[in-house]
Interface confidence: medium
């Protein structure tokens, strides 16, 4: 079940997932001047069995030099229109797979990927928050938010974090 909305926004904080639950989708976004290849995947999908999870589909970008270089807007998967963005960072060595069954690791970057990743999270996903550089944490925790299903609707729990300059 996809989460209906974005994780909460905390002023002067960013969020990040440690790993992604099966069913999570990641849009195949390309940076300015590039576009998805024809017949390329719209998104990557975290799938798997009880013992192993991985990302299905590959994102591929190609130069759009022969076309308009205005920002490409990737069509959203039908089931979900919300955009959850996390700042693109260099790929991290993820946690040991065995410790998080049913989760995919952070997918490695693809060539000419957009600077922001747009994820579509599923119920049960947890994201973690930290104050951005130059701000410090008040009310130090728990600095996490979980997408929960309550009475047929999804909602994100509120992280107890305040970032002050």
């Amino acid at each position: 079940e996809l989460c209906d909305d974005d994780p909460p926004e905390i002023p002067h904080a960013t969020f990040k997932a440690m790993a992604y639950k099966e069913g999570t989708m990641l849009n195949c976004e390309c940076k300015r001047g590039f576009r998805r290849i024809k017949s390329g995947s719209l998104y990557m999908l975290c799938t798997g069995s009880s013992s192993h999870s991985s990302w299905d589909n590959q994102c591929q970008c190609t130069s759009s030099a022969t076309r308009s270089t205005t920002k490409q807007v990737t069509p959203q998967p039908e089931e979900q229109k919300e955009r959850k963005t996390t700042e693109m960072q260099s790929p991290m060595q993820p946690v040991d797979q065995a410790s998080l069954p049913g989760h995919c690791r952070e997918p490695p970057p693809w060539e000419n990927e957009a600077t922001e990743r747009i994820y579509h999270f599923v119920v049960g996903q947890m994201v973690y928050y930290q104050c951005v550089q130059g701000y410090r944490a008040l009310h130090r925790g728990p600095a996490e938010s979980v997408c929960k299903m309550t009475h047929g609707k999804t909602r994100w729990t509120q992280p107890q974090l305040i970032c002050t300059g």
């Epitope: 990040k16 946690v95 040991d96 930290q130 550089q133 944490a137 009310h139 925790g141």
Partner: antibody
Framework: QMQLVQSGAEVKKPGSSVKVSCKAS????????ISWVRQAPGQGLEWMGG????????NYAQKFQGRVTITADESTSTAYMELSSLRSEDTAVYYC????????????WGQGTTVTVSS | DIQMTQSPSSLSASVGDRVTITCRAS??????LNWYQQKPGKAPKLLIY???SLQSGVPSRFSGSGSGTDFTLTISSLQPEDFATYYC?????????FGQGTKLEIK
């Protein structure tokens, strides 16, 4: 149950640097904060700084800003604390400790690393 | 930064005694207060988190109370292994300051 194992004792000259490691085993490393706390002989506990490995950025106590660097390598589940421009007052036992997102206290500690600064 | 002040700084007591250590924060920290025990040559051990929650594996003779600025650690009946130094620590804001410690000695 997670364990934190620190590198061995060090003897350093004033003005030099020391780098202490803290390797986690038996649990998920990335989603915890790793703090570094020091204790000078006969003194209390002093927080130096901390890092949340999934973010990679560290927080430092004002007192150590510019002199301490805390990093984490997720591929080896190891955190590091480097202290530069050492002086005799930096002689202490240095501990790493994990915090579950800053709220539940530091529930797992390394065994401590003794750093002696002496000419 | 928030300062933490413990009292007393040292305390003599006997096995079986009821002992209370107090910790005061320089500003309100809600219930973001942890207590640790440290024995000579050993790393600190978390006893109480969030002011009153007993850490797993810690004997029930240890209890914590308080909220805002004033907090208490109580040992209901001292055991020989309880003689150690105790520290409070606030986890409300960065930096997470410790109290100066209370040394609990055998009378």
């Amino acid at each position: 149950q997670m364990q934190l194992v620190q590198s061995g004792a060090e003897v350093k000259k004033p003005g030099s640097s020391v780098k202490v490691s803290c390797k986690a085993s038996g649990g998920t490393f990335s989603s915890y904060a790793i703090s570094w706390v020091r204790q000078a002989p006969g003194q209390g506990l002093e927080w130096m700084g901390g890092i949340i490995p999934i973010f990679g950025t560290a927080n430092y106590a004002q007192k150590f800003q510019g002199r301490v660097t805390i990093t984490a390598d997720e591929s080896t589940s190891t955190a590091y604390m480097e202290l530069s421009s050492l002086r005799s007052e930096d002689t202490a036992v240095y501990y790493c400790a994990r915090e579950m997102y800053y709220y539940y206290g530091m529930d797992v500690w390394g065994q401590g690393t003794t750093v002696t600064v002496s000419s | 930064d928030i300062q933490m002040t413990q009292s007393p700084s040292s305390l003599s007591a006997s096995v079986g005694d009821r002992v209370t250590i107090t910790c005061r924060a320089s500003q309100s920290i809600s219930s973001y207060l942890n207590w640790y025990q440290q024995k000579p040559g050993k790393a600190p051990k978390l006893l109480i988190y969030a002011a009153s929650s007993l850490q797993s594996g810690v004997p029930s003779r240890f209890s914590g109370s308080g909220s805002g600025t004033d907090f208490t650690l109580t040992i209901s009946s001292l055991q020989p292994e309880d003689f150690a130094t105790y520290y409070c620590q606030q986890s409300y804001s960065t930096p997470p300051a410790f109290g100066q410690g209370t040394k609990l000695e055998i009378k």
